[in-house]
């Protein structure tokens, strides 16, 4: 199952985590896709590593863990956010977070 | 004996098109995510692309994005590198490589092919 | 793209001696970092993996550490064998890149 923080907020400027955990006695986790909305923000593969889309690279760092640490807000990065874990043998399971930007 | 054997390098001119294959055997191949790496001569080792054991993910150095394609075929214990629109800086020795599990360190390499780009 | 920086880009050194080299990466890359061996003609071979575990059969001799940006090989007491181009590694960003090499000659 994934379990998130549904609603999160943060000031404009700021940073704030997206986080998603997995939680599973016998499933591997082998992929992590981070969206928002429809755009790719990052890629996390186990065998190869992080792959963070160009047109966020300067504001979205990896971590902690397989979450995302998004920089720099503007009140554009208000809205939904998809994480979709890809597990072995287990299947896909996928996590939403609203984030509201606040202005500072 | 844990083995990868490259092959299909050689000449080619500017523009046109090489797959190299490289063979599997003595692991699990299906297991694992595998590589490409090239060195030019007299140069240092450059990544060019990787695949997960599935193919559910790839990734590519810049320099070759668009123009060269990673995949593979478990059933055949194969890994391939269709690159297109080469160029005389693709001018090197192709390795393919297999990681150490959960490392991402590259533990077997082949012997390599060469592949020469010139007119 | 990571840029790994490794100093120096060579350096003279005596059987017994102990040598050290750097890695830098242009960002944060956790402790995901390999160092590999290289002689002429041959294959790289895998000496340290994660920054700092020694990988099967390689000799004690070699070690890694660092974490984040900074990373060092370190060779405690350089064997004849020893002679060879080192590069490092990194593996937590796509694309995954090399540093330029480290080349330990002979003095």
């Known amino acids: 199952t994934i379990d998130t923080k549904r609603n999160i907020s943060a000031e404009e400027g700021g940073s704030v985590i997206l986080q998603c955990h997995f939680s599973s006695d016998t499933a591997e986790v082998t992929q992590v896709d981070w969206k928002q909305q429809d755009q790719l923000l990052a890629i996390y593969s186990v065998d190869l590593g992080w792959h963070v889309a160009s047109v966020f690279s300067d504001r979205v760092v990896p971590g902690p863990s397989l979450g995302l640490t998004f920089q720099s807000l503007t009140m554009n990065d208000t809205g939904e956010y998809f994480c979709t874990y890809h597990t072995y043998p287990g299947g896909i399971y996928k996590g939403r977070i609203f984030l509201k930007v606040q202005e500072s | 004996e844990v083995q990868l054997v490259e092959s299909g390098g050689g000449l080619v001119q500017p523009g046109r098109s090489l797959r190299l294959s490289c063979a599997a055997s003595g692991f699990t191949f299906g297991d694992y995510a595998m590589h490409w790496v090239r060195q030019a001569p007299g140069k240092g080792l450059e990544w060019v692309s990787g695949i997960t054991w599935n193919s559910g993910s790839i990734g590519y150095a810049d320099s070759v994005k668009g123009r060269f394609t990673i995949s593979r075929d478990n059933a055949k214990n194969s890994l391939y590198l269709q690159m297109n629109s080469l160029r005389a800086e693709d001018t090197a020795l192709y390795y393919c490589?297999?990681?150490?599990?959960?490392?991402?360190?590259?533990?077997?390499w082949g012997q390599g092919t060469m592949v020469t780009v010139s007119s | 793209d990571i840029q790994l920086t490794q100093s120096p880009s060579s350096v003279s050194a005596s059987v017994g001696d102990r040598v050290t080299i750097t890695c830098r990466a242009s960002?944060?890359?956790?402790?995901?970092l390999a160092w590999y061996q290289q002689k002429p003609g041959k294959a790289p071979k895998l000496l340290i993996y994660?920054?700092?575990s020694l990988q099967s059969g390689v000799p004690s001799r070699f070690s890694g550490s660092g974490s984040g940006t900074d990373f060092t090989l370190t060779i405690s007491s350089l064997q004849p064998e020893d002679f060879a181009t080192y590069y490092c590694?990194?593996?937590?960003?796509?694309?995954?890149?090399f540093g330029g090499g480290t080349k330990v000659e002979i003095k």
């Open positions: 960002q944060g890359i956790s402790s995901w």
């Open positions: 994660g920054a700092s």
């Open positions: 490589a297999k990681p150490v599990p959960k490392s991402r360190g590259l533990d077997v």
């Open positions: 590694q990194q593996a937590f960003y796509l694309p995954w890149t």
